[in-house]
């Protein structure tokens, strides 16, 4: 069984969050994928999504968020550039597959952005600031407007208990039953 986990990223304003969400490529290579924020007590909010069907290695930009789906490698790359304190929150990658419920990809990311510019990109402690130039081919995709009434209605509190699920992705149905999520620093 796979544990539903949360990773805590502590970054400074101006830095870049640069993460990967891996998925079962045989199942989801061309499925539309999205980057969501889960605010306490609210439904997940989709901030950006890939095209439908998702195009291979084709950057999609929505504001300061860039998504790039590498089908061959079963990886979605998510970059949030020029981070601001207000970007702090809990994030997740999901796969849309209507009419089914969306699937959430591990791991969730607890982003904490603090004031005080440090010249470090992403999680690298001693390197120079990363300035991302968005490729001219970047497109903006339309994301599904619906959020299933059965999906997350409350962000899980930080805790240390494990939640197991039999597959690499978790179906978001009845996630309100999930009470605790381990936090790994």
């Amino acid at each position: 069984a796979t544990k539903l986990t949360e990773e805590k990223y502590e970054l400074k304003e101006g830095q870049t969050l640069d993460v990967k969400c891996d998925y079962t490529l045989e199942k989801f290579a061309s499925s539309q994928k999205a980057w969501q924020i889960i605010r306490d007590g609210e439904m997940p909010k989709t901030l950006a999504c890939t095209e439908r069907p998702s195009k291979n290695s084709h950057p999609v930009q929505v504001g300061r968020i860039i998504l790039e789906d590498y089908h061959d490698h079963g990886l979605l790359r998510v970059r949030m550039v020029n981070l601001q304190v207000e970007d702090s929150g809990l994030y997740q990658c999901v796969i849309y597959q209507p009419p089914k419920e969306p699937h959430m990809l591990f791991d969730r990311i607890r982003l904490v952005v603090t004031k005080g510019f440090s010249g470090t990109p992403g999680s690298n402690e001693n390197s120079t600031q990363n300035v991302y130039k968005i490729p001219p081919t970047t497109t903006k995709a339309l994301c599904p407007l619906y959020t299933s009434p059965r999906t997350v209605t409350q962000a899980p509190p930080k805790s240390t208990a494990d939640v197991s699920t039999p597959d690499s992705e978790i179906n978001l149905t009845n996630v309100t039953d999930i009470i605790r999520v381990p936090v790994f620093n």
Epitope: T2, T5, E7, Y9, D18, V19, K20, C21, D22, Y23, T24, L25, S57, Y70, D72, H73, G74, L75, R77, R79, F106, D107, I109, P121, G122, S123, N124, E125, N126, S127, T128, N130, V131, Y132, K133, P135, S168, F184
Partner: antibody, heavy 124, light 107 residues
Framework: QVQLVQSGAEVKKPGASVKVSCKAS????????INWVRQATGQGLEWMGW????????GYVKKFQGRVTMTRDTSISTAYMELSSLRSEDTAVYYC?????????????????WGRGTLVTVSS | DTQMTQSPSSLSASEGDRVTITCQAS??????LNWYQEKPGKAPKLLIY???NLETGVPSRFSGSGSGTDYTFTISSLQPEDIATYYC?????????FGGGTKVEIK
């Protein structure tokens, strides 16, 4: 001691398959992705793909798709790379390498720990 | 795929010399570049990650710099134990790709 120990050299005929093993010790096997890189004699390094030992998810470079399979046995902290339909140009040293990342899901592809390599010779 | 052009392919320098190797990417890789050292019969060893960060335990005579598509690896004072082949590796885009390598010898 933190290390990756690979299986011994193999000699195979064209068309056959080879399965190389990579046993991890000294660290939590499921916490780091395993990648496979090969080096043909006198040639440079070539990435073949990656595997998440925790979930078993994999990704393969296009040129190897359909011929390569990366698997693992978490009970013995071992990763495997199987390459089928071997041809002479697959003669190479095959390395397993650990992807180190400050955060599990960060886009960092630093290979900080390597096996000693397994020489696979394909010859009729 | 992102092509990595590494130069020179080989070089010979004297002990104590400053040695510079360059790697040029076919597209912007956003500093997502590592440098490895490979000695005959041994596995590659990570020296520099994310263009300019020195891996723990690696001597400070090794350094890296660059941005965009152009990156440089420097050995400030060549030592006999530095005889090896050096490779750059990009991860700005998938698939990961390596430079062709630079073989460093001592005169």
């Amino acid at each position: 001691q933190v290390q990756l120990v690979q299986s011994g050299a193999e000699v195979k005929k064209p068309g056959a398959s080879v399965k190389v093993s990579c046993k991890a010790s000294g660290y939590t096997f499921t916490s780091y992705d395993i990648n496979w890189v090969r080096q043909a004699t006198g040639q440079g390094l070539e990435w073949m793909g990656w595997m998440n030992p925790n979930r078993g998810n994999t990704g393969y470079v296009k040129k190897f798709q359909g011929r390569v399979t990366m698997t693992r046995d978490t009970s013995i902290s071992t990763a495997y790379m199987e390459l089928s339909s071997l041809r002479s140009e697959d003669t190479a040293v095959y390395y397993c390498a650990r992807r180190r990342a400050v955060y599990r899901s960060s886009w960092e592809w630093y290979f900080d720990l390597w096996g000693r390599g397994t020489l696979v010779t394909v010859s009729s | 795929d992102t092509q990595m052009t590494q130069s020179p392919s080989s070089l010979s320098a004297s002990e104590g010399d400053r040695v510079t190797i360059t790697c040029q990417a076919s597209q912007d890789i956003f500093n997502d570049l590592n440098w490895y050292q490979e000695k005959p019969g041994k596995a590659p060893k990570l020296l520099i990650y994310h263009a300019s960060n020195l891996e723990t335990g690696v001597p400070s005579r090794f350094s890296g710099s660059g941005s965009g598509t152009d990156y440089t690896f420097t050995i400030s004072s060549l030592q006999p134990e530095d005889i090896a082949t050096y490779y750059c590796q990009q991860y700005g885009n998938l698939p990961l790709t390596f430079g062709g390598g630079t073989k460093v010898e001592i005169k």
